[in-house]
Interface confidence: low
């Protein structure tokens, strides 16, 4: 399926609007510090060039690869060296090394100011004045802060962003209409970014075999009536899509994703009865809907797995003849029967099964050796079940904020070398598992909780990779993708850690505390809590609770005072002294 001009091919397939949006996202994800206007200029130049190639595919440079065209364009940025330092050295390389070099310089935690939301009237005026620029700005701002955001999905978010403004800027109460929609888009967007980051980490750090295994398990849960050959085809196609997006090949990725959605909708009968409502929607919405579709009902009377995978005398023969396919079928058969298991647990079971076959198929009596393999699964299943049960009980007892605090203490004691902002961000997100999953029925709790925790812990891993400070974090992040969560769960208090010296400045607060939003106040208090634990890692729960209660009382008192700043100046040192005494 070769084309004379790749850029013309993609322009025709995607259409001008999506083409321009995707090129803007690609450039913004690579050059995260460049001003908006610079990116718009580059995108317009690429688009004009693409149009000349559509008119004549034989025109000069139209036969060049997209990486060559886009890389050449990025390397024309005048301030590359002063803005990005050594990233400018990428431009001295040839493709494909140049693109690999750009990919390696993507920054998961760019030093960009937090996005401030203007007044609703200001946003509506900007939207009406120049809708196209307003939406491009959204794509640019999200893409540069989330360099692995799933590009075709970002176009879907932008379409929803546009729809929200189109509707709400005409409403009687613009703010009441718009703000909840923007909050929802922000929260969903952050979740989508984190989920995609795990897919890219899986592909880049553990290879496409790891991603394919994940996809077999997840798609088998979603489509338990589909046969293995069908699931395998979807997995192959999905792997190609995500490999492309994670590799910066956003045009190919979006094009292939559209093809996959088309295939799924044309073959609903052999995939799932749940696809119908997705398939009537327009492209971006359809692809999103298919990705989020609920699990189909399990076929009735599925026979026991034991017959083919334990009792059969041919297990070792089948395994030897086609290891990955046989293990893939095992994973498919297990996953379609267990929508109540997390994908990560299913992958652990497949790994355990593989390890047993590796050992037993070399034994004198293989059948006797692997006869009890399913019994060995029990502890692997019970571990996440118990973890979810215990943590949901704790969440129900404490509520979200205090549950987050419990996790902050737990994780700071495990890995106190990690930076305080990272510990706060990750623990706050770990704590959100309660509200997200604990309200669900028993059968949905584990897949919700453990697969969400995998996404959050991946964020810890990518941030830690940028500035490694803890051997324990490196070990948990790199040894096994499927065992990351159990690895972190198993970490104990780091006995080798030398407590941080007490710094009064860290615990000095001012009247600006009083004007912060509730969320910002929580972050301030949680930052102080992490610092306390770093100072006194062996402090008991009761000691830390006492200090935090005093802190809340001190802030509340000063925020009610007439002269707030004077109160903070007077009461602050008293709080610090009392805290030190309480933790002595």
């Amino acid at each position: 399926d070769t084309h004379k001009s790749e850029v013309a091919h993609r322009f025709k397939d995607l259409g001008e609007e999506h083409f321009k949006g995707l090129v803007l996202v690609a450039f913004s994800q690579y050059l995260q510090q460049c001003p908006f206007e610079e990116h718009v200029k580059l995108v317009n130049e690429v688009t004009e060039f693409a149009k000349t190639c559509v008119a004549d595919e034989s025109a000069e440079n139209c036969d060049k690869s997209l990486h060559t065209l886009f890389g050449d364009k990025l390397c024309t940025v005048a301030t590359l060296r002063e803005t990005y330092g050594e990233m400018a050295d990428c431009c001295a390389k040839q493709e494909p090394e140049r693109n690999e070099c750009f990919l390696q310089h993507k920054d998961d935690n760019p030093n960009l100011p937090p996005l401030v939301r203007p007044e609703v009237d200001v946003m509506c005026t900007a939207f009406h004045d120049n809708e196209a620029t307003f939406l491009k700005k959204y794509l640019y701002e999200v893409a540069r802060r989330h360099p692995y955001f799933y590009a075709p999905e970002l176009l879907f978010f932008a379409a929803r962003y546009k729809a929200a403004f189109a509707e709400c800027c005409q409403a009687a109460d613009k703010a009441a209409c718009l703000l909840p929609k923007l909050d929802e888009l922000r929260d969903e967007g952050k979740a989508s970014s984190a989920k995609q980051r795990l897919k890219c980490a899986s592909l880049q750090k553990f290879g496409d075999r790891a991603f394919k295994a994940w996809a077999v398990a997840r798609l088998s849960q979603k489509f338990p009536k589909a046969e293995f050959a069908e699931v395998s085809k979807l997995v192959t196609d999905l792997t190609k899509v995500h490999t492309e997006c994670c590799h910066g090949d956003l045009l190919e990725c979006a094009d292939d994703r559209a093809d996959l959605a088309k295939y799924m909708c044309e073959n609903q009968d052999s995939i799932s009865s749940k696809l119908k409502e997705c398939c009537d929607k327009p492209l971006l919405e359809k692809s999103h809907c298919l990705a989020e579709v609920e699990n189909d009902e399990m076929p009735a009377d599925l026979p026991s797995l034991a017959a083919d995978y334990v009792e059969s005398k041919d297990v070792c023969k089948n395994y030897a003849e086609a290891k990955d396919v046989f293990l893939g079928m095992f994973l498919y058969e297990y996953a379609r029967r267990h929508p109540d298991y997390s994908v990560m647990l299913l992958l652990r079971l497949a790994k355990a099964y593989e390890a047993t076959l590796e050992k037993c198929c070399a034994a004198a009596d293989p059948h006797e050796c692997y006869a009890k393999v399913f019994d060995e699964f029990q502890p692997l299943v019970e571990e996440p079940q118990n973890l979810v049960k215990q943590n949901c009980e704790l969440f129900e007892q404490l509520g979200e904020y205090k549950f987050q605090n419990a996790l902050l203490v737990r994780y700071t004691k495990k890995v106190p070398q990690v930076s305080t902002p990272t510990l706060v961000e990750v623990s706050r997100n770990l704590g959100k598992v309660g509200a997200k999953c604990c309200k669900l029925p028993e059968a949905k709790r584990m897949p919700c909780a453990e697969d969400y925790l995998s996404v959050v812990l991946n964020r810890l891993c990518v941030l830690h990779e940028k500035t490694p400070v803890s051997e324990k974090v490196t070990k948990c992040c790199t040894e096994s993708l499927v065992n990351r969560r159990p690895c972190f769960s198993a970490l104990e208090l780091d006995e080798a850690y030398v407590p941080k010296a007490f710094n009064a400045e860290t615990f000095t607060f001012h009247a600006d505390m009083c004007t912060l939003s509730e969320k910002e106040k929580q972050v301030k208090k949680q930052t102080a809590l992490v610092e306390l634990v770093k100072h006194k890692p062996k402090a008991t729960k009761e000691q830390l609770k006492g200090v935090m209660d005093n802190f809340a009382a001190f802030v509340e008192k000063c925020c009610k005072a007439d002269d707030k700043e004077a109160c903070f100046a007077e009461e602050g040192p008293k709080f610090v002294a009392a805290s030190q005494a309480a933790l002595a």
């Epitope: 589909a226 046969e227 009968d269 599925l302 005398k313 003849e321 498919y332 058969e333």
Partner: nanobody
Framework: QVQLVESGGGLVQPGGSLRLSCAAS????????MSWVRQAPGKGPEWVSA????????RYAESVKGRFTISRDNAKKTLYLQMNSLKPEDTAVYYC????????GSQGTQVTVSS
């Protein structure tokens, strides 16, 4: 690309016999258990019979036990279903699947039992 092509269906009187074949390609046929599944008009798929990769272990749904026989020829990459003492309630589209799936991934072959 995995392909399964069934043949051998047709119209037969009650009590009669038919032999269905399923030709496989695109995967290591000899490494996988296989099943026959059927779908009667207006009904969901029903698992009929399964055979392990080597052909030694066979299993049947209660409704066909003693009347149907599943077999395979790994050299020819073909799965068979010998159907004897056919009844009107055996009327359905029959299709073969890899493993124990009851999802229809191929066209199937129509079997009609009627006098």
């Amino acid at each position: 690309q995995v392909q399964l092509v069934e043949s051998g269906g047709g119209l037969v009187q009650p009590g009669g016999s038919l032999r269905l074949s399923c030709a496989a390609s695109g995967f290591t046929f000899g490494s996988f258990g296989m099943s026959w599944v059927r779908q009667a008009p207006g009904k969901g798929p029903e698992w009929v019979s399964a055979i392990d990769s080597g052909g030694a272990d066979t299993r049947y749904a209660e409704s066909v036990k003693g009347r149907f026989t599943i077999s395979r020829d790994n050299a020819k990459k073909t799965l068979y279903l010998q159907m004897n003492s056919l009844k009107p309630e055996d009327t359905a589209v029959y299709y073969c699947t890899i493993g124990q799936s009851t999802s229809r991934g191929s066209q199937g072959t129509q079997v009609t039992v009627s006098s």
